[in-house]
């Protein structure tokens, strides 16, 4: 099969303000093996907003059990959305390595919005 | 070589129920979600049903909800419908699609060749 | 759903644009993906030609293309061959529920 791809099936996301907005992943491939990551913003500045191997994220769960054998979809939710939160966000593959893993490839990206809470 | 071959389809009576049946090969049929596209003779493509690769969710679109049902059997690599209290309106060519991602019914990179199912009186 | 001409003609070597507009998510600012499909006689197995927008598998032949703006996605074929007489149907999905076609253009090589 080709090269894995990271595919984020949704261009753009609009969430109200206090729910959750769910961003979807999908890996074509269990290989390389290393780590996703879910940024927002690209380059330098990005802000990490998930690590599948450390960190503590209390926004933050996984769509799919993402210990499960053979997982290949990398959703996630963040909860309680705010303006603050607007932005696009990457779901990016990483390649195990030592003692760093190594950026493997990125998604699209997914822009999220956020509209007033309803009244 | 990306393979996917339907069988089951049929001639049946207003009411009836059929299973139609995908024999995958060529992939992993674990890492895509799969899906059912009919065609109704002189009209166009009508996605049916779609389940992931992932953790099996269902999707159907409104027309066939509460009576189609679909299921893989992913150490058979194969893809099943269940279609009962069929209509005459489900006559239609029943194709077996590979979709390109493992959740979500999104873009069908392979198709098999079609199974014929007739609702007829 | 999705909306395409129901027809459209080329020369021969000329280019042709087929475009397709709506889909899910315009309302509220979600927005997916389009993708194009060919099939060349009905009952025949559809083949993809684009998805993703503007991808098109290694097996399609360089003269279709796929573009997007908006809510609108076009498939250009350039240097169109007689054999790309056939129905083309556009597509698009949400990820929540599933996918829907356009009803298809028929394209006629002149």
């Known amino acids: 099969e080709d090269e894995l791809q990271v595919i984020q099936p949704e261009k753009s996301v609009s969430v109200a303000a206090g729910e959750s907005a769910t961003l979807r992943c999908a890996m074509t491939s269990l290989i390389p093996v290393g780590p996703i990551m879910w940024f927002r913003g690209a380059g330098a500045g990005r802000e990490l907003i998930y690590n599948q191997k450390e960190g503590h994220f209390p926004r933050v769960t996984t769509v799919s059990e993402l210990t499960k054998r053979n997982n290949l979809d990398f959703s996630i939710s963040i909860s309680n959305i705010t303006p603050a939160d607007a932005g696009t966000y990457y779901c990016v593959k990483f390649r195990k390595g030592s003692p760093d893993d190594v950026e493997f490839k990125s998604g699209a990206g997914t822009e999220l919005s956020v509209r007033a809470k309803p009244s | 070589d990306v393979q996917l071959v339907e069988s089951g389809g049929a001639v049946v009576r207003p009411g009836e129920s059929l299973r139609l049946s995908c024999k995958a090969s060529g992939f992993t049929f674990t890492n895509f979600a799969m899906s059912w596209v009919r065609q109704a003779p002189g009209e166009g493509l009508e996605w049916v049903s779609g389940i992931s690769g992932s953790d099996d969710t269902t999707y159907y679109a409104d027309s066939v909800k509460g009576r189609f049902t679909i299921s893989r059997d992913n150490s058979e690599s194969t893809l099943y419908l269940q279609m009962n209290s069929l209509r005459a309106e489900d006559t239609a060519v029943y194709y077996c699609v590979k979709d390109s991602t493992v959740s979500w019914n999104t873009f069908f990179d392979y198709w098999g060749l079609g199974t014929l199912v007739t609702v007829s009186s | 759903a999705l909306t395409q001409p129901a027809s459209v003609s080329a020369n021969l070597g000329g280019t042709v644009k087929i475009t397709c507009s709506g889909g899910?998510?315009?309302?509220?600012?979600?927005?997916?993906?389009y993708g194009w499909y060919q099939q060349k006689s009905p009952g025949s197995a559809p083949v993809i030609l684009i998805y993703w927008d503007d991808k098109r598998p290694s097996d399609i032949p360089s003269r279709f293309s796929g573009s997007t703006s908006g809510s609108t996605t076009t498939l250009t074929i350039t240097g169109v061959q007689a054999e790309d007489e056939a129905v083309y149907f556009c597509?698009?999905?949400?990820?929540?529920?599933?996918?829907?076609f356009g009803a298809g253009t028929t394209l006629t090589v002149l």
């Open positions: 597509g698009t999905y949400d990820t929540s529920s599933g996918a829907i």
């Open positions: 899910y998510g315009s309302d509220d600012g979600s927005s997916s993906y």
